[in-house]
Interface confidence: low
């Protein structure tokens, strides 16, 4: 997260860290007791490493009573996701067992109504991604409030030049932005999960390259079919 600040500890009980061989790789969001939603491209970076999900964390390194690392029973990338595009960049991870829910671990309701979020709406994005262009990684969860950007502006030739589909949404990126390591994390508007940070290698913090998020409402049928 660029231009953000340390989050209030455990105030986002849905927040997950997708880890490979014990290292944070991507963000994720707990959407059901045994399921974490993330970005499909995160798995490509995992190679053959052991994928696990950390729940109930604020600090990645410090012992915290609510923290627990779960093994992944199965990973379900969206069937249409491909390495060369950010289309359908969603991944569902089934935990080896149901998460122990509590004040610091709780699923987040996700948007099922397939309607664009009003441009200008302030949404919260959180993650353990880099906090500087130099690549400094935070130990504690960071967050930032970002205004939603209308798709037409986001698709301008000077911005993303038509790459933003109806199944994606954008947020402003003027110094405040999601960045490397935040992929798969939640974009929350009004207490509801609206978007998932895409995992492209986009430049961060440049206002002409807005943040791109996969709209979960557009994938309600797929999410329901996997969770069923």
């Amino acid at each position: 997260i660029l231009g953000g600040r340390e989050a209030e500890a455990h105030a986002r009980p849905y927040m997950a860290s997708v880890q490979v061989n014990g290292e944070h790789l991507c963000g994720g969001v707990l959407v059901a007791e045994q399921w974490v939603l993330s970005a499909a491209h995160c798995l490509e970076d995992a190679a053959d490493g052991k994928v696990q999900v950390l729940l109930g964390a604020h600090s990645l390194s410090q012992p915290e009573p609510s923290k627990r690392l779960y093994d992944v029973l199965r990973a379900v990338p969206h069937p249409d996701s491909r390495p060369d595009t950010i289309d359908h960049d969603l991944l569902l991870l089934q935990l080896s067992e149901k998460a122990t829910l509590g004040p610091a671990v709780r699923p987040l309701p996700w948007q099922r109504v397939d309607r664009d979020v009003e441009p200008g709406t302030l949404c919260d994005v959180a993650g353990w991604g880099i906090v500087s262009h130099a690549g400094r990684r935070p130990d504690r969860l960071q967050h930032v409030l970002l205004p939603v950007l209308d798709r037409a502006t986001c698709n301008r030739r000077t911005h993303h030049d038509g790459a933003i589909t109806q199944r994606m949404m954008c947020a402003e990126s003027n110094r405040r932005d999601s960045c490397k390591g935040d992929s798969g994390g939640p974009l929350v508007c009004g207490g509801v999960l609206e978007g998932v940070v895409t995992s492209g290698s986009r430049v961060c913090g440049n206002r002409k390259k807005p943040g791109i998020y996969t709209r979960v409402a557009s994938y309600a049928a797929w999410i329901d079919s996997v969770l069923a």
């Epitope: 340390e6 209030e8 500890a9 455990h10 600090s59 410090q62 012992p63 915290e64 009573p65 609510s66 923290k67 627990r68 122990t100 509590g102 004040p103 610091a104």
Partner: antibody, heavy 119, light 108 residues
Framework: EVQLQQSGPVLVKPGASVTMSCKAS????????MNWVKQSHGKSLDWIGV????????SYKQKFKDKATLTVDKSSSTAYMELNGLTSEDSAVYFC????????????WGQGTTLTVSS | EIVLTQSPALMTASPGEKVTITCSVS???????LHWYQQKSGTSPKPWIF???NLASGVPVRFSGSGSGTSYSLTISNMEAEDAATYYC?????????FGTGTKLEIK
């Protein structure tokens, strides 16, 4: 009104073990962490560890790892701390303290349990 | 672990006097994670100032807190008899949580 009611003073012999209790009321017990803090006579405060009453997960200060065991009974909203292998160094007042998760400071303290270790 | 050193260890102040207690932290912490507690003899500590500068409920406005990084302070603008107590700073930045060495404040 939030209250943390601790068990009464105890006098034990060296080498013995003791369990003290802390009964919480006035709030939802599982929604806040419970910490334990030691205060030797005339000394500063020393954090022992913390327990998440919801999950039973604990974290201890290194020097108390083999000395203290924290547990809870959710049904009675009570936290417990067992201290083993007692020596005169363990003579102190022990406080149970609410804090963490929804409050990142120690907002409510029990009245303290005085432990005296003497032969 | 993070070490908190308070100074002075003991001080005496006259009624109406301005009092400042300092807390030096061994490594930089977020100001939201530095707290102060007041303890009177034979009683439990009470939360006094949290997040460096926020007064806990019922704390008189003559108290204030400030600081950042590794240096924090608690100030009483005009000392009153009821302020005589021991004050402890404490960090919530990382486990293990640690307290300052304490400052005993007495009234002249």
């Amino acid at each position: 009104e939030v209250q943390l009611q601790q068990s009464g003073p105890v006098l034990v012999k060296p080498g013995a073990s003791v369990t003290m209790s802390c009964k919480a009321s006035g709030y939802t017990f599982t929604e806040y962490y419970m910490n334990w803090v030691k205060q030797s006579h005339g000394k500063s405060l020393d954090w022992i560890g913390v327990i998440n009453p919801y999950s039973g997960g604990t974290s201890y200060k290194q020097k108390f790892k083999d000395k203290a065991t924290l547990t809870v009974d959710k049904s009675s909203s009570t936290a417990y701390m067992e201290l083993n292998g007692l020596t005169s160094e363990d003579s102190a007042v022990y406080f149970c303290v609410r804090g963490g998760l929804r409050r990142n400071y120690f907002d409510y303290w029990g009245q303290g349990t005085t432990l005296t270790v003497s032969s | 672990e993070i070490v908190l050193t308070q100074s002075p260890a003991l001080m005496t102040a006259s009624p109406g006097e301005k009092v400042t207690i300092t807390c030096s932290v061994s490594s930089s912490i977020s100001s939201t994670n530095l707290h102060w507690y007041q303890q009177k003899s034979g009683t439990s500590p009470k939360p006094w100032i949290f997040g460096t500068s926020n007064l806990a409920s019922g704390v008189p406005v003559r108290f204030s807190g400030s600081g950042s990084g590794t240096s924090y302070s608690l100030t009483i603008s005009n000392m009153e008899a009821e302020d005589a107590a021991t004050y402890y700073c404490q960090q919530w930045n990382s486990y293990p949580f640690t307290f300052g060495t304490g400052t005993k404040l007495e009234i002249k």
